[in-house]
């Protein structure tokens, strides 16, 4: 019966142990624990390799230790003279004495306690596919964000379902696309357009790379489209094998992507659109609308492109255009976004030269680089004048964005040599 | 420098001082020093200084020390077991690549290299400036920079001078078109310790500039005529060596 702790004493302890004794103790603690065995007393006849008398500690087929002689604790605050830690729940202790003892030896006193083992780190085989969590007496597996634990409680997959796409036009891609998609996952995407719109899916052959079918032609990883009672697919392989335009004849489409444990590829990317409250044409300075129409209606999408030298700053990254949608409330989406002058930022420093601070760093501003005269001159021409261009770079008419190079002037002494008359 | 005058480093801002062996060199850009092969053949990690007229220890401490990264000796320079017995100074030219770029200013700036056109072919009588801290009439080594102006002379003038302390037969000394002979006027000449310094000639296409027409190489006898490495013959090798051993910052 496993126990959490116990005591092991040599025969007759604390009196002298008898000659010609062989005694063994089988220690067992509950599953999921290791054993900490420690000796608080050790007084056994000393011999080379403990050949005469000894206490042996055995774990499975491995001898963890063989003790004899006298030991005393190195730590004044601890009675422990020798200790063993094993990550298994069984241990055998064997005490042997030979036919004679030259002196009176009192043997040993030992204690064992069950200790937690770390199944996550103490063994070669990692039990979990992703994250392993140790607890006293066992362990459990867990998953990174967006993954979930399968029924085997060891492997994780991605819970990539639940996305509902209601926009009139959009793009859907497998998780991580174009990086390999996750293993062991089922991803379900739903497109739900208002009634009166048919979902049309367009795929490019090169935007599809899914683990190929087995020899029987069954897809190991697959992409399936389900529109009402009609199914398109399953599809798999390198290059999309189905029609590049799928007219679903439905406003609702379920996209199911199923992956197994092996052979992840880059996945897939598709575009979809829906085939037919007006929104007013707003005045957005420094931009053009595409397409230009006399009237815009619900679900119309325009691309607003900034004029050269202007940009829309979204999420701290400059873009030259953005999309706006005529919404059901008669207002345009992204109405807060505006085209503002490009900021080229602080000009770069150059070696052996300088640039004067410009009054402005916005589009059209001009800066001038100069070299540290008279010791350096501008080697690569261009005159040193740069303007803030529409792409956000400081640009020179000759060098483009390349910076001027200040190189040493050669062969000019600061003072001419004058021979002194003798 | 024999028969020369006191000079200021501002007259020769390209002048580089080598302390072992005691010699000279010429700064040709931020990363490169041109010198004579015989200066660096025995010490591939020379310590160099720029920007100081005086090479007194206390003054050198305040000047700019240059650290070499690599020494490139011309492949045509023959390395000898016993350099002291050398009679062949052909291809006496070397480049020293510096670890860090030199900051230019009034006391430190490079000398130009000769162009490849015939404008840079020297004629007898063309004047050049030499400078250095080598032997003078009075002492073995100068503490303050000396300089002299001397004319280019026909090579035979150098051949005619008897070698002062010959280490071999007079016929053994090699004279080649890679050498310039200069001097013979008022006893002005370069001497031991001036090696590697520039023989600076006014640029024919820009009178405000000087170029390194020669490098102090060897001579039969100080105070007569001296032989200088003809730098024009090595411009291709200099440019190729610098190009192949440059960093992105320089390109």
């Amino acid at each position: 019966e496993p126990t959490m702790y116990g005591e092991i004493l040599s025969p007759n302890y604390p009196q002298a142990y008898p000659s010609e004794v062989e005694k063994s103790w089988d220690i067992e603690v509950p599953e999921g624990y290791g054993i900490h065995l420690y000796f608080t007393h050790l007084d056994i006849e000393l011999s080379e390799n403990c050949a005469y008398d000894s206490v042996q500690i055995i774990s499975g087929d491995t001898e963890e230790g063989r003790l004899c002689g006298q030991r005393s604790s190195n730590n004044p605050h601890s009675p422990i003279v020798e200790e063993f830690q094993v990550p298994y729940n069984k241990l055998q202790v064997i005490f042997k004495s030979d036919f004679s003892n030259e002196e009176r030896f009192t043997g040993f006193a030992a204690y064992y306690v069950a200790t937690d083992i770390n199944e996550c780190t103490d063994f070669v085989d990692v039990p979990c596919s992703h994250f392993c969590n140790n607890f006293i007496g066992g362990y459990f597996c867990s998953c990174p964000p967006e993954y979930f634990l399968h029924d085997d409680m060891k492997n994780c997959g991605v819970n990539c379902s639940g996305d509902v796409f209601t926009a009139l036009i959009g793009e859907i891609a497998s998780p991580n696309y174009p990086k390999p998609y996750p293993e062991n996952s089922r991803c379900e995407y739903q497109i739900r357009l208002e009634k009166g719109f048919q979902v049309v899916v367009t795929l490019r052959r090169e935007d599809f790379d899914v683990e190929a079918a087995d020899s029987a032609g069954n897809c190991l990883d697959s992409l399936v489209f389900v529109a009402g009672d009609r199914q398109f697919g399953p599809y798999c392989g390198h290059g999309f094998p189905g029609p590049l335009n799928i007219e679903t004849k439905s406003n609702a489409l379920d996209i199911i992507f199923q992956t197994d444990l092996t052979g992840q590829k880059k996945g897939w990317k598709l575009r979809y659109h829906g085939d037919p409250m007006p929104c007013p044409k707003e005045d957005t300075p420094n931009s053009v609308w595409e397409p230009a129409k006399a009237k815009y209606v619900f679900r119309d999408v325009v691309q607003i492109t900034c004029l050269d030298g202007f940009e829309v700053v979204e999420g701290r990254v400059g873009a030259t255009s953005f999309y706006s949608t005529c919404q059901s409330n008669g207002k345009w989406s992204n109405s807060k976004l505006k085209c503002q002058p490009v900021d080229c930022g602080i000009p770069e420093s150059i070696e052996n030269g300088k640039v004067e601070d410009p009054e402005s760093t916005l589009f059209g501003s001009v800066i001038r680089y100069t070299c540290e005269e008279p010791y350096y001159y501008m080697e690569n021409g261009g005159g040193g004048e740069y303007h803030c261009a529409g792409n956000g770079s400081w640009v020179n008419e000759v060098l483009g964005p390349e910076l001027p190079k200040c190189v040493p002037v050669c062969g000019v002494p600061r003072e001419p040599f004058e021979e002194k008359q003798r | 420098i024999i028969g020369g005058s006191d000079a200021d480093i501002k007259n020769f801002p390209w002048q580089v001082f080598f302390d072992n062996p005691w010699a000279g060199g010429a700064l040709i850009n931020e990363y490169w020093v041109l010198t004579a092969a015989h200066v660096v053949e025995g010490n591939r990690e020379p310590t160099m200084y720029v920007g100081s007229t005086s090479v007194q220890t206390s003054r050198l401490a305040k000047s700019k020390m240059l650290t070499p990264e690599h020494v490139f000796i011309h492949p045509g320079w023959k390395l000898l077991e016993v350099p002291e017995g050398r009679t062949n100074f052909d291809n006496d030219i070397a480049l020293v690549r510096l670890k860090d770029p030199v900051k230019m200013g009034p006391t430190v700036s490079p000398i130009c290299l000769p162009g490849t056109s015939s404008d840079y072919n020297l004629m007898d009588g063309d004047l050049g400036l030499i400078s250095g801290w080598g032997r003078t009439e009075k002492r073995d080594r100068a503490v303050r920079l000396k300089a002299a102006r001397l004319p280019v002379a026909p090579l035979r003038k150098c051949k005619e001078v008897k070698v002062e302390k010959p280490t071999a037969d007079a016929e053994a000394y090699v004279f080649t078109p890679n050498m310039i002979c200069a001097g013979g006027e008022k006893g002005m000449d370069s001497c031991k310790g001036d090696s590697g310094g520039a023989f600076a000639v006014q640029d024919p296409n820009d009178k405000t500039k000087f170029y390194a027409a020669g490098l102090v190489s060897w001579g039969p006898q100080c105070g007569t005529y001296g032989l200088y490495t003809r730098v024009k013959n090595y411009v291709d090798w200099i440019m190729k060596t610098m190009q192949e051993n440059s960093t992105p910052r320089e390109d």
Partner: antibody, heavy 118, light 109 residues
Amino acid sequence: EVMLVESGGGLVKPGGSLRLSCAASGFTFSNYAMSWVRQAPGKGLEWVATISSGGSHTYYLDSVKGRFTISRDNSKDTLYLQMNSLRAEDTALYYCARLFTGHAMDYWGQGTLVTVSS
Amino acid sequence: QIVLTQSPATLSLSPGERATLSCTASSSVSSSYLHWYQQKPGKAPKLWIYSTSNLASGVPSRFSGSGSGTDYTLTISSLQPEDFATYYCHQYYRLPPITFGQGTKLEIK
């Protein structure tokens, strides 16, 4: 030899102020844009602010905008960072750095420690 | 803002081995504005590689840098004991903030 030496760090209570200085030498200070970068104990580098060579243009990390001011005195070859309304999360080693080609930070000071704690 | 993600967070290798440190940007970065720094404990960072592939002064030739767009790499061909340190990638973009990666600690195995 290019040198940047920061000073002015210390222990300050939340809501307090500090002014950091960075003394530059060995280069023409007025030719270079400069930055402050900080590093919280045991953490990575975080850019704080940048100033142009002449001091007319400044950029800040959002979390310090309105509380910190970067400035420079080119006549004294010194860069400053005035830090007001300090918070515990501003605790870090603050470095000044010189900006070079591509806005790479080619020279850094040794750093000055700012500790914000009650 | 442009987020730089360095991988791995820690790299344990032995001297003589080849090390590859990766830096991935959330948006495309100009190769002229992507730099690497080396930092040792208790010391200030040092510019190590600038503009993707140019070694800073004094950096040994066993180091190299490459990349474009969103993916950049620092490679050490044969690790020397003095190379064990933390390496940060850094990008400049004209709109603040300027960002650093979280660092890769290169440690002796």
